[in-house]
Amino acid sequence: LSTGVSFFFLSFHISNLQFNSSLEDPSTDYYQELQRDISEMFLQIYKQGGFLGLSNIKFRPG
Amino acid sequence: SVVVQLTLAFREGTINVHDVETQFNQYKTEAASRYNLTISDVSVSDVPFPFSAQSGAG
């Protein structure tokens, strides 16, 4: 069975940011800004075609 | 620091797991200057099919 889509799980640290409780709440400005920056960054990185998008963003303390 | 975890979706056959990681790692310097994000400890793995079928590419 093939979906025509490949999925990859990716994790990384952002060492110059501090985790706080607002990153547990998707309604906060901090969460939304970071999510927007990360989404935009991935569109830049994988702009060569084939990239369909990203999902399931989670933030955790490092 | 903040640990970020997410799922990336690509059209099947257009990229291998090595290039997903390599292309991300090669962008780290630009991420620091453009987004002020200092990225480290990058890890990439393929998602087993049963999970990927549920996760969508939203």
Partner: antibody, heavy 120, light 107 residues
């Protein structure tokens, strides 16, 4: 037409180094990744590593990270592989091979091979 | 590292025979599987990529199939010029390992 022309056969003493070249023509050198593969006499193929001549990014098979260094000269459209601390087990034919362009996960063109013989 | 186990290591068949070579990966390589043909004293030549896509100029008697960890290369009607050693290669993750090869001979 695309061509990868490698330097000639070499005979080296144990402990010596050797630099093998791979001259590319017929395409834009900086837009294709160049890989190196070795084949010991009568044996199979073993992947050494690659260089992206556009960015000079290299990636090595861990087995060869202290054995080989890959470089590229954009102006000469030539890739190089230098092998260090040669031992008799390094006697092999060494190939350069071009990886196809975007989303092309295969080696579409190969050099003719360079035989490196290590013997005292 | 992903190990590629190729079988058989050698094979003798008659002209016109249907021949199948198999390659098993130690992990899922998601169809990033390549087949090469190497004739004695020559460089390898690309036959099949993405597990089943035949490269330009390769005769249609060659075909690739498989998915996940199991792949095969089939020659539907063996010809004298097919005498060679055939290698599979993992192109999913580094190191981009090769199978140990299958030496094909004519009976």
């Amino acid at each position: 037409q695309v061509q990868l022309v490698q330097s000639g056969a070499e005979v080296k003493k144990p402990g010596a180094s050797v630099k093998v070249s791979c001259k590319a023509s017929g395409y834009t050198f900086t837009t294709y990744t160049m890989h190196w593969i070795r084949q010991a006499p009568g044996q199979g193929l073993e992947w050494i590593g690659y260089i992206n001549p556009g960015s000079d990014y290299t990636h090595y098979n861990q087995k060869f990270k202290d054995k080989a260094t890959l470089t590229a000269d954009k102006s000469a459209s030539t890739a190089y592989m230098e092998l260090y601390s040669l031992r008799s087990e390094d006697t092999a034919v060494y190939y350069c091979a071009r990886q196809g362009n975007y989303a092309a996960y295969y080696f579409d063109y190969w050099g003719q091979g360079t035989l490196v013989t290590v013997s005292s | 590292d992903i190990q590629m186990t190729q079988s058989p290591s050698s094979l003798s068949a008659s002209v016109g025979d249907r021949v199948t070579i198999t390659c098993r990966a130690s992990g899922n390589i998601h169809n990033f599987l390549v087949w090469y043909q190497q004739k004695p004293g020559k460089s390898p030549k690309l036959l099949v990529y993405n597990a089943k896509t035949l490269t330009d100029g390769v005769p249609s008697r060659f075909s690739g199939s498989g998915s996940g960890t199991q792949y095969s290369l089939t020659i539907s009607s063996l010809q004298p010029e097919d005498v060679a050693t055939y290698y599979c290669q993992n192109f999913w993750n580094v190191p981009f390992t090769f199978g140990s090869g299958t030496k094909l001979e004519i009976k």
